[in-house]
Interface confidence: low
């Protein structure tokens, strides 16, 4: 099970001074990167118990396994459900305390039971402040039961629940009807998967049978031991005030686990630390009573003590659990609780012991989880035990469980049972992360989710060229850091693995799948200048420029043209992608708009240095056409326009211009100037007879505006050839040659 | 002297609504639990709804949910049962009663009024 | 849901005769939450028994009830005339829904 502890502080007169804490044993727990172990959460859990919103607590982190939950204001943030969350991947557990009002109406006798599928689970709620109405049963803050004031039995409303199955499992609370539900009395029920001393699949392991209290899990077969003691199967007692699986843990302050409740990994739950008892963990063990919640009793022999903390304590030649052994009878000395072995690998354990008559090499025997018995290789005898070693065959995950290690002499036997697990080394499920690349190097995140077992202990990075058949190149590598891989070769295809190992002799697993990277071009170097550019309308610009003489080909695959409007903070790029061009018109510009313009040659996705800036100025945009242009034939070479002013204009017009065209003709326009802006009419002389023209005019302010409608009017027949299209305006005879 | 006297009952349609009150007398109404029972022609008792005395809990037998809402006004001293979507097996007498103290055992009942679901 | 028995479904006795109902629950009625009712022709029914053996108010003690778990009787010591009618069962103490038992009649014999 993870080693996760949630220690609450129920020294209660002062909500101010309540905290909550959550601990981890585990290795590298917290450092906050999903493969690598994520951080511990520890939060007040408000979906089935909603308390009044009041400011919000503040949570701080002590180094990477502890966080604490304090800033509680008044009695009422207390009550409810608290969690905490740690591990990493499958290993992710949540521990769950749940926190009753000393005031409520109504009291658990109990808050955590903890029942085996198939077993009557009995809710008890004290009556502590009495009303006469219905007690309402909730599961999972849902209406599930009621029952009557005058149902109570010597003070308490019970729940009885037969058969209970896993899914029964959640937060119950018993509370008076129409009563404040922070009044209620809150329980925690925890449905083992499985029937009693029975864990898996299919409930078909038989559990290691637990001591002082511990629980077995029915997913794993391991003990999650109370609070204060330790070993596969909680067989060792801590130290008075400390707890987690290896006993690392002390609990604060002088008065040592006093007033504090401890919740550890389902299906264990909450109880006081060992040596207390009582609602608020304050009340030391009545004699002869021991162990978390005082569940236990001693019952000690031959001459053994009664200690609260640890149980017995035997006298000299003594031993055992009630001090029921002679020391004469064989035992198993300093035996590990738990090993743990990577898959494939050809182990060798060792099994001391002692007693009289002495253990002798045969004597001492390992037996597997499937009942397969070993005998040692080898034993070293020493004055006062005898070390059997066993060599084990090559570990399948079947080989996960628990193995026995068994000594017996005439003088008797012992036994010690002790966790194998089997670990699966890890093997990379996707490829590294490429995350930028330059011409000779590669940032690569290792960082990648995997099958197997952690923790991860080294990871090393393959890498070789595309299709090459030359050596890996390999760095060990920090898996939370980006890699850069250098001295790489441009523009060329690499490709890149991972393999990860974790401790252990054969730790190392497969290498993950590869992928390809590929190194950027080289990038360009030379500097182009602008030579020019001049405008080609309102929203024209054609820029041109030069790159400097170089021996060699060019390294260029075309040119970036940037302008940037300053007043609107906007930049417009233009790709030109040829690196031979050396001119461009940029069109859809933003009439009367200050450009700053630079160009830069680029290769691939690498962009050179750019030019010196320009600065360029595009003319406002003109005025709106000229309204209902009408054509009307006055001769043989003579025809008159009329229109109407723009509307809307932005200033004063300084002139219009006319454009002509013969009708299909293949040659340019003719734009004629009308140089006197309040005329609304105009004579076009000079025409051919018998000839179609079209016409269309436009006004000027500062800059050219835009075309009216087109006109089409024929001149009247029989004239002679004219030398050309003038201008004359009504107001002024006065014609223009074009 | 503690009453509870039933009205709204009649003739209606498959398909069509009414609305039963219950009016309550001689006893404290707001600080108790309220029911609806009915029995069919012939036939037995059973549950219908009930209602806790602030009106906030509400529970249905799976026959009627989502086609009756009990509720009630305390201010009124009045019970209502609003059936909707009204089927003949809905055809009954529907008795309002009240629970004994913080008890669903029905101490008090009003004398009835009769639901015919017919076409 | 639980359901309730009742039994017999008629009873022909004699006033002064001793009268035993039965009622039976298909699982566990807990603490005893079982109440008994009487209905006279054209009448709503009458409290007569809750909590399985308490009197309701102004019960005569000729009427008392008793039992737990899934068997409940109720009996009349001593019937009177006006003591032939049907009586119902109840459970309140389960989870929802509050279930009746069919009745049993008692009619004179």
């Known amino acids: 099970a993870v080693d996760l502890t949630l220690l609450a502080n129920l020294r209660l007169t002062d909500p101010q001074r309540f905290f909550l804490t959550c601990v981890s044993g585990e290795a590298g727990a917290g450092r906050g990167s999903d493969a690598w172990g994520p951080p511990l959460l520890l939060e007040k859990d408000d979906r089935i118990v909603r308390t009044p919103p009041g400011p919000p607590l503040r949570l701080a982190r002590n180094g990477s396994h502890q966080v604490t939950l304090r800033g509680f204001s008044k009695p009422s943030d207390l009550v409810g459900v608290f969690s905490c969350v740690g591990g990493a991947g499958a290993r992710r557990t949540r521990v769950i305390y749940v926190h009753n009002s000393p005031g409520a109406h109504l009291l658990p006798d109990k808050v955590t039971h903890t029942v085996n599928k198939g077993d009557t689970a009995v809710l008890s709620a004290r009556v502590h402040k009495e009303k006469q109405t219905d007690v309402i049963w909730k599961s999972n803050g849902s209406y599930f039961y009621t029952l009557d004031w005058h149902e109570a039995q010597d003070g308490r409303f019970l729940l009885q629940l037969p058969n209970v199955q896993p899914p029964s499992s959640g937060i119950y609370s018993a509370t008076y009807l129409e009563a404040s539900p922070l009044g209620s009395a809150f329980f925690r029920l925890i449905v083992r998967g499985c029937g009693a001393g029975r864990w898996g699949p299919g409930c078909t392991k038989e559990c290691p049978g637990c001591l002082h209290g511990g629980v077995c899990h029915d997913h794993d077969g391991e003990c999650v031991c109370p609070p204060g003691f330790t070993g596969t199967r909680c067989e060792q007692a801590c130290r008075e005030g400390r707890f987690g699986q290896s006993c690392q843990e002390q609990c604060p302050g002088i008065s040592g686990c006093r007033g504090l409740t401890f919740c550890l990994p389902d299906p264990y739950g909450c109880s006081c630390g060992s040596g207390w008892r009582g609602s608020q963990c304050q009340e030391a063990c009545a004699p002869g009573h021991f162990g978390a919640d005082c569940r236990l009793q001693c019952q000690c022999q031959n001459g053994g003590t009664c200690d609260r903390f640890s149980g017995c304590v035997c006298p000299s030649g003594w031993h055992g659990v009630h001090c029921e052994k002679s020391d004469r009878i064989p035992q198993i000395l300093n035996m590990a609780s738990e090993l743990e072995f990577n898959l494939e690998t050809m182990p060798r354990i060792n099994c001391a012991a002692a007693g009289n008559p002495f253990p002798v090499r045969g004597s001492i025997e390992l037996r597997k989880p499937d009942g397969t018995v070993l005998l040692s290789t080898k034993a070293i005898v020493e004055p006062e035990k005898t070390t059997a070693e066993f060599e084990v065959p090559r570990l399948v995950l079947a080989d996960s469980g628990f193995w026995e290690c068994r000594v017996s002499t005439s003088g008797g036997q012992d036994s010690r049972r002790f966790k194998v697990n089997v670990k699966v080394p890890p093997v990379p499920l996707a490829a590294p992360r490429l995350l930028t690349k330059q011409s000779r190097q590669l940032v690569v995140s290792p960082l990648v989710s995997f099958s197997g077992d952690g923790p991860i202990s080294t990871v090393r990075l393959h890498y070789r060229p595309q299709d090459s058949t030359m050596d890996w190149s390999t760095i060990v590598v920090d898996p939370s850091e980006n890699v850069t891989l250098m001295n790489l070769r441009p523009k060329t295809g690499y490709s890149v693995r991972v393999q990860l190992s974790r401790p252990g002799e054969g730790g190392e697993g497969a290498w993950g799948p590869p992928t390809l990277m590929t190194t950027d071009c080289p990038e360009p170097l030379l500097q182009p200048w602008l030579e020019g550019w001049h405008v080609e309308g309102t929203d024209r610009l054609r820029v041109s420029w030069s790159l400097p003489l170089v021996p060699g080909p060019l390294v260029g695959d075309g040119f970036l043209l940037r302008l940037w409007d300053g007043t609107r903070g906007q930049e417009r790029r233009e790709n030109v992608s040829s690196p031979q061009a050396r001119t461009a018109l940029l069109t859809g510009l933003t009439p009367g708009t200050h450009y700053q313009l630079d160009v830069q040659l680029y290769h691939c996705t690498l962009l050179g240095p750019a030019s010196p800036p320009a600065h360029v100025l595009l003319p406002p945009s003109g005025p709106p056409a000229p309204r209902h242009l009408h054509a009307q034939a006055l001769s043989d070479s003579e025809i008159q326009l009329t229109w109407k002013h723009p509307e809307a204009l932005p200033g004063p017009i300084s002139k219009y211009v006319v454009e002509v065209q013969v009708a299909g003709g293949a040659g340019d326009p003719l734009w004629i100037d009308v140089d006197r802006p309040e005329e609304t009419s105009t004579i076009i002389r000079g025409l051919n007879a018998s000839t179609r023209y079209l016409f269309r005019m436009r006004a000027s302010i500062q800059g050219l505006g835009d075309w009216s409608n087109t006109v089409e009017e024929s001149t009247l027949g029989n004239g002679l050839q004219a030398e050309g299209p003038v201008q004359e305006s009504r107001a002024a005879e006065e014609g223009l040659d074009q | 002297e503690v009453q509870l006297l039933e009205s709204g009952g009649g003739l209606v349609q498959p398909g069509g609504s009414l609305r039963l009150s219950c009016a309550a007398s001689g006893f404290t109404f707001s600080q108790y639990t309220m029911y609806w029972v009915r029995q069919a022609p012939g036939k037995g008792l059973e549950w219908v709804s009930s209602i806790y005395p602030s009106g906030g809990w509400t529970n249905y037998a799976d026959s009627v949910k989502g086609r009756f809402t009990i509720s009630r006004d305390n201010s009124k001293n009045t019970l209502y049962l609003q059936m909707n979507s009204l089927r003949a097996e809905d055809m009954a007498v529907y008795y309002c009663?009240?629970?004994?103290?913080?008890?669903?055992?029905?101490?008090?009942w009003g004398q009835g009024t009769m639901v015919t679901v017919s076409s | 849901d639980i359901q309730m028995t009742q039994s017999p479904g008629t009873l022909s006795l004699s006033p002064g005769e001793r009268a035993t109902l039965s009622c039976r629950a298909s699982?566990?009625?807990?603490?005893?939450?079982l109440a008994w009712y009487q209905q006279k022709p054209g009448l709503a029914p009458r409290l007569l028994i809750y909590g399985a053996s308490r009197r309701g108010t102004g019960i005569p003690d000729r009427f008392s009830g008793s039992g737990s778990g899934t068997d409940f009787t109720l009996t009349i010591s001593r019937l009177e005339p006006e003591d032939f009618a049907v009586y119902y069962c109840q459970q309140y103490g389960s989870t929802l829904p509050l279930t009746f038992g069919g009745g049993t009649k008692v009619e004179i014999k």
């Open positions: 699982q566990t009625v807990s603490s005893g939450s």
């Open positions: 009663a009240r629970g004994r103290g913080g008890s669903k055992a029905f101490d008090i």
